[in-house]
């Protein structure tokens, strides 16, 4: 019955945030890339 | 992200009330909601909660006299079944498994002949 | 039903000095770490401060630190800061899929 319970941690969620802040760098990186070319 | 309580009101004692937590930002199909409530000038007290696949669980002094349920992805209802002037308090949605990482301001419920 | 049990209920220590709370579950929390505690203050929800056990929630000052295992903890809070006023509260989860809180400590700050 205890299995998978408390599955939404707060340190998952932090892994999240940090995964989502890291996307955001390199796709925010690569359109200021893109924007510079043109 | 966050997480906001809604529908507290004065009640009289046996009347139903519904109360809405409804979130932004994250959606309900990946996270836990907690039910907790506060008394005036008392402490915490945990209701129940309902998880991402929508397994419920609560306090054993809550069993009956609240239901929880998830409604949409991003709302989750408590009702308070036949509400005495005992469930006068404050109550939070909270966020979290474990632990309660995202609360609402909570809405006040007044139960009161 | 597990029980909390929080102490002191009240303590009082001047700026600069250092408060330590105790929290004794009744039974052992979930993976014996599944202990949070958490900062209050009048009118406001509380705030997480730490999680499991002891690691510390985001934008918490070190200041801040929780120890303990199983059915024992403890939160300290030093260099105390007029700010850190408040009620303090620890929670468990179990392995049932419930919760429980403690009675909560009030901090005041000379």
């Known amino acids: 019955h205890s299995d998978g319970i408390f599955t939404d941690s707060y340190s998952r969620y932090r892994k999240q945030m940090a995964v989502k802040k890291y996307l955001a760098a390199v796709l925010g990186k690569r359109y200021k890339q893109r924007v510079k070319n043109k | 992200q966050s997480v906001e309580a809604s529908g507290g009101h004065l009640v009289t004692p046996g009347t139903p009330l519904t109360l809405t937590c409804t979130v932004s930002g994250f959606s309900l199909s990946s996270a836990a909601m907690n039910w907790v409530r506060q008394a005036p000038g008392k402490g915490l007290e945990w209701i129940g909660s309902v998880d991402e696949r929508q397994n419920k669980y609560y306090a054993s002094w809550a069993k009956g006299r609240f239901t929880i349920s998830r409604t949409s992805s991003t709302t989750v209802n408590l009702k308070m079944t036949s509400p005495t002037t005992e469930d006068t308090a404050t109550y939070f949605c909270?966020?979290?498994?474990?632990?309660?990482?995202?609360w609402g301001q909570g809405t006040l419920v007044t139960v009161s002949s | 039903a597990q029980v909390l049990t929080q102490t002191p209920s009240s303590v009082s220590a001047a700026v600069g000095g250092t408060v330590t709370i105790n929290c004794q579950s009744s039974?052992?929390?979930?993976?014996?770490?599944?202990l949070s505690w958490y900062q209050q203050k009048p009118g406001q929800p509380p705030n997480l401060l730490i999680y499991?056990?002891?690691s510390l929630a985001s934008g918490v000052p070190s200041r801040f630190s929780g120890s303990g295992s199983g059915t024992q903890f403890t939160l300290t809070i030093s260099d105390l800061e007029c700010d850190d006023a408040a009620t303090y509260y620890c929670?468990?989860?179990?392995?049932?899929?419930?919760?429980?809180f403690g009675g909560g400590t009030e901090v005041v700050v000379k």
């Open positions: 499991e056990a002891s």
């Open positions: 929670a468990g989860a179990y392995n049932t899929g419930i919760y429980g």
């Open positions: 909270a966020r979290g498994g474990g632990e309660f990482f995202i």
């Open positions: 039974q052992s929390v979930y993976s014996n770490n599944r």
